[in-house]
């Protein structure tokens, strides 16, 4: 069962190589690498590296990335993250402290600012830091629906841990119907989950961001480790040029 | 951009087919075909039948077939089916009728006959036949779990509609920890999604097969549309055989 | 996508999902699968050019990347993507048995 | 599975995925990634003998057509079957971009 | 088709002022940096600076030769490049060509070109 | 600044030739080198950006070639209508600058 040629790794490599200079280039849609005159000098700043290693960590709850589809998702995706709205703002009063929920509002001007169109996000997740917990938890995702009403997401059954972990809801179906309706304001609640005959709802989960009594004071940790949404979209000028070349081959 | 030889259809056709000759018989695992010397004369069982359409059929809520696992997933795989003790057995008088959920109870001696051994099921999964469905409904899984405990396993939103239509949950680690226990009875439950402030919390959604008061008659269709496992597993005699030959190449 | 619905419908010389349907008794001389009589097997084929090089007009090529040589390959080829099970009924004796073949239906290829 | 375990602690001649890091600087004379100063990008590379004709011994065959052939091609072929995306950052201008490029790390190979 | 066609040109007398124009058509004009360049009678090419795209702020940036005495703008509503010049110096006597500039460190498309003279 | 020198400033060539051009830069410009060809009264114009890459609607018997600080351009076989001056620029590091030009002429 042996083939005739005998193969040259080294040339093999090679063309690896070569093919996935190619390949980088062509998922950026660059003809060649942008120049690096105006980079400022010194390291990256903070947030940057913030959100790349955000991007780089699988978190939990988080799947494996599904096979793309074979055109638009073949392109690279920009990343960007909208944080949650501090918990001090007024969109909170609204909602009455409960024992089972917690509630996490985002400005959609924000949203709409790193991606334009709804047609143009290609993944968001809700990622929350989740501080110590003692006891296993069964969680649910909830999307502000209308007044007073909210629609059931999906849930994830947390496992006791003695450390904070990150946790990942594809929310991408949501935040697209988000970009193209008008609300200035939309939200999300994470509750504890409710059996029909049980009577001990409250949610154990201490989530980073919320400095209620009930949450103890996690002020010191928040800042960038409070709730937010990682956005994956095509960047708008990346699209255009999509459109414009939508023809096969 | 072209390649310089000329592909000759035919023979990539003849080729193929010739492979597909040989990967048929590799997936069961036979030397050569089966012989046709003992089968019995008419159509194929009604019941065979059934069983060959049910896996045929994707159904709602299953996901499409996973990038399978290279080795034991690439063989063919036995698929049996094993249907709900019926209602009028006694082990439902334990549980009390509520208008919240329904318990579909299964035979564990069944499930051994059908597969010896727990890491022979490769997937299990739970088919209930829906009836028509006035208005939305989200419905939770549950796996009993010790005396009068339930495990939550996973939910679905079902949308309104006016034909039966088949519903399927994967249950395979469920079943499979069936199979290594030593019960006699093991069962699920399909409740109404309870949230913590609603009150509304009544089991909508018709499935065939119950024949309570509030279920309405639906003896006329029962049979073999009543819940059932449908198990895909290695057969012991191909698993033994993987066993023997699990060396690399 | 490289799928039945674009490449049964062009006449595409790049890698494409090609038709291809197998009877079993016609094609394999069987007898022995009772359901399903054939299927849709199918099967990938057409080239993959390695369409990079230093001197290459680079701007022409990029564009082309994305269909010819996505994952970047010393030596792309046409290969399924997606792929669906096909459930037989055979018998073994006088048993009639139902197996379920996994990854036997071409739906779709790519250059990987 | 022919995965980087199994692969990169063997001498396995056949389909596997084999090592190779590529360091931006270095092997693409790039300095505009800022971050990741390179990656675990490997490639897949080996034979996947077609193991199938009328006359072959079927018994000795049947039991690699697992490995060699499991998709019954015409011509197999070993490629890309897991693989993990990479983020990279980069300035356009002054501003830097966070991006994430699907499908840039080989992690399993496969005959297809 | 990508087209710059710039307007403005004249004779200027020493430490006089002048705005020259731009007027682009045929690509998303935000969406990328312009810049001015000029050539003196019979010499090479010089770069003078650019305005930065929406993604970059619309900044500025100018060679030491002319920061303090040109200021470069843009009018995205008009798809429109200006350079205002300042004490103008004899030597300041050039074509002046717009020019769009890529991100790899390049222009790919300029324009005609507009003649300034600087003159007593 | 980086400072840009070309060589020769002048040439002469017959149709046909295959020539050069080159373009030294004062410090490593990491193959950000472009070359423009400028017409007699004409507006310059994009040949080859990042060391070798062709703009769109050049002829591919222009080419380029280097690294570090020296770089090529090279015309395989020259035509009338390549009468001309061309620039090399670098994009390495701002601010932009350009070569002083090679004046190619037919013989």
């Known amino acids: 069962l042996s083939t005739c040629k005998t193969i040259d790794m080294e040339l093999v490599k090679r063309k690896r190589i070569e093919a996935i200079r190619g390949q980088i280039l062509s998922k950026l849609r660059l003809a060649s690498p942008p120049s690096q005159g105006e980079v400022p000098p010194g390291p990256l700043p903070e947030a940057v590296l913030a959100l790349y290693n955000s991007t780089r960590d699988r978190v939990a709850g988080e799947s494996a990335e599904p096979e793309p589809e074979p055109e638009a998702d073949y392109y690279a995706k920009e990343v960007t993250r909208v944080l949650m709205v501090e918990t001090h703002n007024e969109i909170y009063d609204k909602f009455k402290q409960s024992t089972h929920s917690i509630y996490m509002f985002f400005n959609t001007s924000e949203l709409r600012e790193a991606v334009p169109e709804p047609v143009l996000l290609s993944r968001a997740e809700l990622r929350l830091l989740r501080l110590k917990l003692k006891v296993e938890q069964h969680v649910e995702l909830y999307q502000k629906y209308s007044n007073n009403s909210w629609r059931y997401l999906s849930n994830r059954l947390l496992a006791p841990s003695d450390s904070p972990e990150w946790l990942s809801f594809d929310v991408t179906g949501v935040v697209r119907q988000w970009l193209s309706r008008g609300g200035e304001i939309e939200g999300f609640r994470l509750s504890a989950h409710c059996s029909c005959d049980s009577r001990d709802n409250t949610l154990q989960v201490d989530i980073n961001g919320f400095t209620t009594g009930r949450r103890g004071d996690l002020a010191t940790i928040h800042g960038m480790n409070r709730p937010f949404l990682l956005l994956m979209a095509t960047p708008l000028e990346r699209a255009q040029h999509l459109q414009s070349s939508r023809h096969r081959r | 951009l072209s390649t310089c030889k000329t592909i000759d259809m035919e023979l990539v056709k003849r080729k193929r087919i010739e492979a597909i000759r040989g990967q048929i018989l590799s997936k069961l695992r036979l030397a050569s075909p089966p012989s046709q010397g003992e089968v019995p004369p008419g159509p194929l069982p009604e019941a065979v039948l059934a069983l060959y359409n049910s896996t045929r059929d994707r159904v709602a809520g299953e996901s499409a077939e996973p990038e399978p696992e290279p080795e034991a997933d690439y063989y063919a795989k036995e698929v049996t089916r094993v249907l709900m003790v019926e209602t009028h057995n006694e082990i439902y008088d334990k549980f009390k009728q509520s208008t919240h959920s329904i318990y579909m109870f299964f035979n564990t001696s069944e499930l051994r006959e059908a597969v010896p051994e727990p890491v022979l099921l490769s997937r299990a999964e739970l088919r209930l036949l829906r009836l028509k469905l006035k208005v939305e409904q989200h419905v939770e899984l549950y796996q009993k779990y010790s005396n009068n405990s339930w495990r939550y396993l996973s939910n679905r939103l079902l949308a309104p509609s006016d034909s039966p239509e088949w519903l399927s949950f994967d249950v395979t680690g469920v079943v499979r920890q069936w199979l290594s226990r030593g019960g006699e009875i093991e069962g699920f439950r399909l409740s109404a999604h309870c949230s913590c402030d609603s009150r509304d919390n009544t089991l909508q959604v018709d499935i065939n097969g119950f024949t309570t008061g509030r279920r309405g008659d639906l003896a006329t269709i029962h049979g073999m549309n009543r819940p059932f496992l449908l198990l895909m597993a290695t057969p012991l005699e191909r698993a033994q055989h993987l066993q023997s030959s699990r060396h690399r190449r | 996508a490289l799928d039945t619905n674009y490449c049964f419908s062009s006449t595409e010389k790049n890698c494409c999902v090609r038709q291809l349907y197998i009877d079993f008794r016609k094609d394999l001389g069987w007898k022995w699968i009772h359901e399903p009589k054939g299927y849709h097997a199918n099967f990938c084929l057409g080239p993959c050019p390695y369409i990079w090089s230093l001197d290459t007009q680079y701007s022409k090529v990029l564009a082309l990347y994305n269909q010819h040589n996505p994952g970047a390959s010393a030596a792309p080829c046409c290969v399924p993507q997606a792929l669906e099970p096909l459930p037989i009924v055979y018998y073994v004796g006088r048993k009639p048995k139902v197996e379920q073949l996994s990854n036997m239906i071409v739906r779709s290829c790519k250059c990987s | 599975a022919l995965d980087t375990n199994y692969c990169f602690s063997s001498t396995e001649k056949n389909c596997c995925v084999r090592q190779l890091y590529i360091d931006f600087r270095k092997d693409l004379g790039w300095k505009w990634i800022h971050e990741p100063k390179g990656y675990h990008a490997n490639f897949c590379l080996g034979p996947c003998p077609y193991i199938w004709s009328l006359d072959t011994q079927y018994s000795k065959v049947l039991a690699l057509y697992n490995q060699h052939n499991p998709g019954a091609s015409a011509a197999p072929c070993c490629v890309p079957q897991a693989l993990e995306p990479l983020p990279i950052v980069y300035y356009v201008g002054r501003k830097p971009k966070v991006e994430q490029l699907s499908n840039m790390i080989v992690r399993s190979c496969k005959c297809s | 088709e990508v087209q710059l066609v710039e307007s403005g040109g004249g004779l200027v007398q020493p430490g006089g002022s002048l705005r020259l124009s731009c007027a682009a058509s045929?690509?998303?004009?935000?969406?990328?940096?312009m810049s001015w360049v000029r050539q003196a009678p019979g010499k090479g090419l010089e770069w003078l600076g650019f305005?930065?795209?929406?993604?970059?702020?619309?900044?500025?940036e100018y060679s030491a030769s002319v920061k303090g005495r040109f200021t470069i703008s843009r009018d995205n509503s008009k798809s429109s490049l200006y350079l205002q010049m300042n004490s103008l110096k004899t030597e300041d006597t050039a074509v002046y060509y717009c020019?769009?500039?890529?991100?790899?460190?390049?222009?790919?498309?300029w324009g005609q070109g507009t003649l300034l003279t600087v003159s007593s | 600044d980086i400072q840009m020198t070309q060589s020769p400033s002048s040439l002469s060539a017959s149709v046909g030739d295959r020539l050069t051009i080159s373009c030294r830069a004062s410090?490593?410009?990491?193959?950000?080198l472009n070359w423009y060809q400028q017409k007699p009264g004409k507006t310059p114009k994009l040949l080859i950006y990042?060391?070798?890459r062709l703009h769109s609607g050049v002829p591919s018997r222009f080419s380029g070639s280097g690294s570090g600080t020296d770089y090529t351009l090279t015309i395989s076989s020259l035509q009338p209508e390549d009468v001309a001056t061309y620039f090399c620029?670098?994009?390495?590091?701002?601010?932009?600058?350009f070569g002083q030009g090679t004046k190619l002429e037919i013989k």
């Open positions: 305005i930065r795209n929406k993604p970059n702020g619309y900044t500025t």
């Open positions: 410090q490593d410009i990491s193959n950000y």
């Open positions: 990042y060391t070798s």
């Open positions: 045929g690509f998303t004009f935000t969406d990328y940096y």
């Open positions: 620029q670098q994009g390495d590091t701002l601010p932009w600058t």
């Open positions: 020019a769009r500039y890529t991100g790899g460190g390049y222009f790919d498309y």
